[in-house]
């Protein structure tokens, strides 16, 4: 089952798959210029069975003279972040990759891939926290969060890590900023079917869609 | 017949970002026809190669809301229009009501 | 382009009944493959993806099979409630394409 939300958003912190489990989806994104292949992938799935995991579905992108893209997301330069993962500014392996069955690794880079990598966790995945330069940590428990089910829905858990800069006092728990709890977040329930006609955020949140037409125009 | 239509597709309840956004129509007493895809994250498109050129699929993430615009309307685009969260491998979980498009003279 | 081929088009069931819809892709997909109910003016709804998995909510008398090239929608026991149009959609590359239907009618 996907995790519906994102992990926790830790202040100055990023956060790093070190493996990902079997299940999980990556977008096949392009960089600027290039899009993917007719009839190619939009995305690669960690798959495999008992003794071996892998990538399955290859992306590839492909020049292309036009681009019908909205919104296009410029990434910081000489920076290589991921949504739902973020690389991490200093190596961290509390994991050998190698010795988790049922994982694949980080997928090797392809040609004209985006700056950004967009994964889709499954329950069960692990992301480790860090704080990013310049910052450092007041662990009050592991510094990870995992995707677990509860009562039909998915939700993080919260990261145990405060980070601090290195020239402020240091923040004791008592006065810490409050962390908005995995508990306290709109979650998605995606057993609920659509509802088309109220679209007002529910105490149980549906997703939902609703469609209408916008304008017509007459040539 | 020639003129555009644009359908808009509001989403709630879920990251609008996290998913990319299917639109599939269906003509009366046909089946399902995939149009396109568009990542709600940064608007990369796949279009179904007989519309390429004549839709347009945009997203606004402010307001977790997609647009499929199709141009130059000819009778056979009379179709019952679709959106859909699409979770790729898991499946077009969440659908829309559906918007009727008639296309006559 | 991959094609999907739905059969049969059309069966004609009773309340009770087993049922069994089959679908075909023109090369292997794997297990990316997903299948919907559609009901009269309704939209449609996931049942199940990823050729076995059922869908939250969905009853458990609906199960799904195969891979590769074969895949199969099975209902265990037909329910008033089950009569409707049933698709098969591959997931594995685009243009993602849909089967052609297959509609359940009472006999």
């Known amino acids: 089952e996907l995790c519906d939300d994102d992990p926790p958003e830790i202040p100055h912190a990023t956060f790093k798959a070190m493996a990902y489990k079997e299940g999980t989806m990556l977008n096949c994104e392009c960089k600027r210029g290039f899009r993917r292949i007719k009839s190619g992938s939009l995305y690669m799935l960690c798959t495999g069975n008992s003794s071996h995991s892998s990538w399955d579905n290859q992306c590839q992108c492909t020049s292309s003279a036009t681009r019908n893209t909205t919104k296009q997301v410029t990434p910081q330069p000489e920076e290589q972040k991921e949504r739902k993962t973020t690389e991490m500014q200093s190596p961290m392996q509390p994991v050998d990759q190698a010795s988790l069955p049922g994982h694949c690794r980080e997928p090797p880079p392809w040609e004209n891939e985006a700056t950004e990598r967009i994964y889709h966790f499954v329950v069960g995945q692990m992301v480790y926290y860090q704080c990013v330069q310049g910052y450092r940590a007041l662990h009050r428990g592991p510094a990870e969060s995992v995707c677990k089910m509860t009562h039909g829905k998915t939700r993080w858990t919260q990261p145990q890590l405060i980070c601090t800069g290195e020239m402020e006092t240091s923040q004791f728990p008592g006065e810490e900023k409050p962390q908005a709890s995995p508990e306290g977040r709109p979650e998605s329930e995606t057993s609920c079917l659509v509802t088309t006609t109220d679209f007002q955020i529910q105490t149980e949140m549906a997703a939902t869609m609703e469609t209408s037409i916008f304008t017509t125009e007459y040539q | 017949p020639g003129a555009s239509v644009k359908v808009s597709c509001k989403a709630s309840?879920?990251?609008?970002?996290?998913?990319?956004i299917s639109w599939v129509r269906q003509a009366p007493g046909q089946g399902l026809e995939w149009m396109g895809w568009?990542?709600?994250?940064?608007?990369?498109?796949n279009y179904a190669q007989k519309l390429q050129g004549r839709v347009t699929m945009t997203t606004d993430t402010s307001t977790s809301t997609a647009y499929m615009e199709l141009r130059s309307l000819r009778s056979d685009d009379t179709a019952v229009y679709y959106c859909?969260?699409?979770?790729?491998?898991?499946?077009?979980?969440?659908w829309g009501q559906g918007t009727t498009v008639t296309v006559s003279s | 382009d991959i094609q999907m081929t739905q059969s049969p088009s059309s069966l004609s069931a009773s309340v009770g009944d087993r049922v069994t819809i089959t679908c075909r892709a023109s090369?292997?997909?794997?297990?990316?493959l997903n299948w919907y109910q559609q009901k009269p003016g309704k939209d449609p709804k996931l049942l199940i993806y990823?050729?076995?998995s059922l869908q939250s909510g969905v009853p458990s008398r609906f199960s799904g099979s195969g891979s590769g090239t074969d895949f199969t929608l099975t209902i265990s026991s037909l329910q008033p409630e089950d009569f409707a149009t049933y698709y098969c959609?591959?997931?594995?590359?685009?243009?993602?394409?849909f089967g052609g239907g297959t509609k359940v009618e009472i006999k």
């Open positions: 859909a969260r699409d979770r790729g491998y898991y499946g077009m979980d969440v």
């Open positions: 309840g879920y990251t609008f970002t996290s998913y990319g």
């Open positions: 568009i990542s709600a994250y940064n608007g990369n498109t």
């Open positions: 090369q292997s997909i794997s297990r990316y």
């Open positions: 990823a050729a076995s």
């Open positions: 959609q591959q997931s594995h590359s685009t243009p993602l394409t």
